[in-house]
C-alpha cells in the first residue's frame, strides 16, 4: 500500500493586504492516525498557525467542515492578511503519540506573498524659504508596500525632473518596504504657483499611481523691486512721492519712509494687488509740503520683506524753486493714510 502523502498543490499564493489567503492541503490517506497542523516556516523556530485541538486562532478557518467525516482536506483560510503574514506555510501530518504526537510528513510548502499598497507619498520641502535661482531639495516618502519593486518619478508643473536620488529600504528580504527620494529643484521668479509632484507606481495600484504634492509657494521667497518716483505737483507747494513695491512673495512686508535718514512713518502691506504669477504689488505714497523746507530733502523708501534684511531706494527732492506761502506751516493737507506732510 502507498504511504500517506501530504499535498500542497500551490507553490505560491499572492494575496492583497486585507484580503483572505487560502492555503490548500490534502492528505492521500486517513492513516497513520494523528492530526494535521499548519506552520509558518520550518525547523525549530517555526510558528504554529493552526492546530484544531488546542490554541486560539481567530483569523484562521478551515475550508472543510470540521464535522465532516473522514475528511482529507486540510486547507485553511487566513483572514485580514498583512505584510507580516508573508512566508512559507507547511501543512504537517503528525502520527499519534503518547504523550506527544510525532511529526510524520510535511507538505512541500506554500509561499504566501502579500501585495501591500504603498502609503500616500508625503512630500516635504526645505525648512526655510529660498529665492529664485537657488536650488532647493524636496523629499518624498512612502511606506508599507510589498513586493519591493516600485517606481518613483518627480514632476514640476507636469515636467519630469531628472535630478533626484531614490532609496528603497531595507535592501534585503522584508515583509514590507519603504521608499525615500530627494529631488533638487531650481527656483524661478515664476514659481509661486508651481507644484512639485512625487508620483509612486506599484503593482498594487493597478496603473493608477499615488501622488504627493508640495506647493512652491511654501518654499519660495521673491524679493521686491522698489521704485521711488515724484509725482506732478498737486498744489503749488506740495509734492506726492510714491514707492512702488513690485513682484514680491510672500505678502509679509513692512515699509518705512525716512526723511533725511529719520523715520517718518512705518506701515505694513495690506491692500496689495496680486499679479498673474502669484507675486504681489503694493504702493505707498508720501505728500510732501516743500514750502516747509529750505534745503533739498532725501526721501528713502525702506522695505523689510518676510523678515529679511531691509532694502531701500532713495529720492532727492529739490525744494529751492518753491516760494514760501503764508500759513502753510499750520494748514497741512491730509488726503489719505499713506500721505505725509513735511513742514
Amino acid at each position: 500500500e502507498e504511504e500517506l502523502q501530504v499535498i500542497q498543490p500551490d507553490k505560491s499564493v499572492l494575496v492583497a493586504a486585507g484580503e483572505t489567503a487560502t492555503l490548500r492541503c490534502t492528505a492521500t490517506s486517513l492513516i497513520p492516525v494523528g492530526p494535521i497542523q499548519w506552520f509558518r516556516g520550518a525547523g525549530p523556530g517555526r510558528e504554529l498557525i493552526y492546530n484544531q485541538k488546542e490554541g486560539h486562532f481567530p483569523r484562521v478557518t478551515t475550508v472543510s467542515d470540521l464535522t465532516k467525516r473522514n475528511n482529507m482536506d486540510f486547507s485553511i483560510r487566513i483572514g485580514n492578511i498583512t505584510p507580516a503574514d508573508a512566508g512559507t506555510y507547511y501543512c504537517v501530518k503528525f502520527r499519534k503519540g503518547s504523550p506527544d504526537d510525532v511529526e510524520f510528513k510535511s507538505g512541500a510548502g506554500t509561499e504566501l506573498s502579500v501585495r501591500a499598497k504603498p502609503s500616500a507619498p508625503v512630500v516635504s520641502g526645505p525648512a526655510a524659504r529660498a529665492t529664485p535661482q537657488h536650488t532647493v531639495s524636496f523629499t518624498c516618502e512612502s511606506h508599507g508596500f510589498s513586493p519591493r519593486d516600485i517606481t518613483l518619478k518627480w514632476f514640476k508643473n507636469g515636467n519630469e525632473l531628472s535630478d533626484f536620488q531614490t532609496n528603497v529600504d531595507p535592501v534585503g528580504e522584508s515583509v514590507s518596504y519603504s521608499i525615500h527620494s530627494t529631488a533638487k529643484v531650481v527656483l524661478t521668479r515664476e514659481d509661486v504657483h508651481s507644484q512639485v509632484i512625487c508620483e509612486v507606481a506599484h503593482v498594487t495600484l493597478q496603473g493608477d499611481p499615488l501622488r504627493g504634492t508640495a506647493n512652491l509657494s511654501e518654499t519660495i521667497r521673491v524679493p521686491p523691486t522698489l521704485e521711488v518716483t515724484q509725482q506732478p505737483v498737486r498744489a503749488e507747494n506740495q509734492v506726492n512721492v510714491t514707492c512702488q513695491v513690485r513682484k514680491f512673495y510672500p505678502q509679509r512686508l513692512q515699509l518705512t519712509w525716512l526723511e533725511n535718514g529719520n523715520v517718518s512713518r512705518t506701515e505694513t502691506a495690506s491692500t496689495v494687488t496680486e499679479n498673474k504669477d502669484g507675486t504681489y504689488n503694493w504702493m505707498s505714497w508720501l505728500l510732501v509740503n516743500v514750502s516747509a523746507h529750505r534745503d533739498d530733502v532725501k526721501l528713502t523708501c525702506q522695505v523689510e520683506h518676510d523678515g529679511q534684511p531691509a532694502v531701500s531706494k532713495s529720492h532727492d527732492l529739490k525744494v529751492s524753486a518753491h516760494p514760501k506761502e503764508q500759513g502753510s506751516n499750520t494748514a497741512a493737507e491730509n488726503t489719505g493714510s499713506n500721505e505725509r506732510n513735511i513742514y
Epitope: 500517506l4 490517506s29 486517513l30 492513516i31 492516525v33 492530526p35 494535521i36 478551515t62 465532516k68 499519534k96
Partner: antibody
Framework: VQLVESGGGVVQPGGSLRLSCAAS????????MTWVRQAPGEGLEWVST??????YYADSVKGRFTISRDNSKNTLYLQMNSLRAEDTAVYYC???????????????WGLGTRVTVSS | EIVLTQSPATLSVSPGERATFSCRAS??????LAWYQQRPGQAPRLLIY???IRETGIPERFSGSGSGTEFTLTITSLQSEDFAVYYC??????????FGGGTKVEIK
C-alpha cells in the same frame, strides 16, 4: 460495511489467543481499526487501535497484546498473550471514523467474539 | 486520561416520554464526543458524533448537545426499541479512548 470477528474461546490464564476480524464493504486499507472489549455486565473498554504502521494500546494490555492488519486480506488481528482472568470479555472489532482533523470514533462494529480466561 | 462520568446510571422512563441523560468530562474535550446505543445482546451502534451530529439513519428523536465538559443526549419520545444502554466516548485526547460507564434506560 460488515465486520466479522472470530478466534474467541476459552483459554487458561497465561495462555494465548489470536482474534481475527474480516472486513468488507469499505476500503479497508484507508481506515484505522480498533478493538474494544466488554467484560460481562460491564461497560465498554478501548483495547487497541492500528493505523498503518502505527499502533496504540491501553495500559492494561500493553506488552501482552499485539494488534496487526493484513490489508491484502482485509483482515484485522489481535494477538493476545499472557492472558489473565480480567481479560475475559466480548471483543469487538470496530472501524474508525475520523472527524475534527484528528479524532476517531467508531462508526461500524462487529457482533463480537467472546474470550473467557479461566482455569 | 480523561474520565467520563455518565448520570444517571439508570433511568426509568415510560414509552413516549422524554429521556435526558448527561456525560461529564474531567477536562475540556471541545466537541470531540460520540454517543453509542447498545441494545441487550447486540454490538454498540453509533448515534451521535462531534457532540451533536446525528449519524446517518439515526431517527431525529435523538439529539446531542453540549461542548467542553458537559454533554447531553436527549430522546424526545421514547420508543420500545430505545430501551438500551447509552455510552459516551471522547476522542479529543487519546490514547486512551475513554468511554463513560453507561446509562441504562429501562421501561418504567
Amino acid at each position: 460495511v460488515q465486520l466479522v470477528e472470530s478466534g474467541g474461546g476459552v483459554v487458561q490464564p497465561g495462555g494465548s489467543l489470536r482474534l481475527s476480524c474480516a472486513a468488507s464493504g469499505f476500503s479497508f486499507s484507508n481506515f484505522a481499526m480498533t478493538w474494544v472489549r466488554q467484560a460481562p455486565g460491564e461497560g465498554l473498554e478501548w483495547v487497541s487501535t492500528i493505523g498503518s504502521g502505527d499502533t496504540y494500546y491501553a495500559d492494561s494490555v500493553k506488552g501482552r497484546f499485539t494488534i496487526s492488519r493484513d490489508n491484502s486480506k482485509n483482515t484485522l488481528y489481535l494477538q493476545m498473550n499472557s492472558l489473565r482472568a480480567e481479560d475475559t470479555a466480548v471483543y469487538y472489532c470496530a472501524k474508525d471514523s475520523t472527524v475534527s482533523w484528528s479524532g476517531d470514533f467508531f462508526d461500524y462494529w462487529g457482533l463480537g467474539t467472546r474470550v473467557t480466561v479461566s482455569s | 486520561e480523561i474520565v467520563l462520568t455518565q448520570s444517571p446510571a439508570t433511568l426509568s422512563v415510560s414509552p413516549g416520554e422524554r429521556a435526558t441523560f448527561s456525560c461529564r468530562a474531567s477536562q475540556n474535550v471541545k466537541n470531540d464526543l460520540a454517543w453509542y446505543q447498545q441494545r441487550p445482546g447486540q454490538a454498540p451502534r453509533l448515534l451521535i458524533y462531534a457532540a451533536r451530529i446525528r449519524e446517518t439513519g439515526i431517527p431525529e428523536r435523538f439529539s446531542g448537545s453540549g461542548s467542553g465538559t458537559e454533554f447531553t443526549l436527549t430522546i424526545t419520545s421514547l420508543q420500545s426499541e430505545d430501551f438500551a444502554v447509552y455510552y459516551c466516548q471522547q476522542y479529543y485526547d487519546w490514547p486512551p479512548f475513554t468511554f463513560g460507564g453507561g446509562t441504562k434506560v429501562e421501561i418504567k
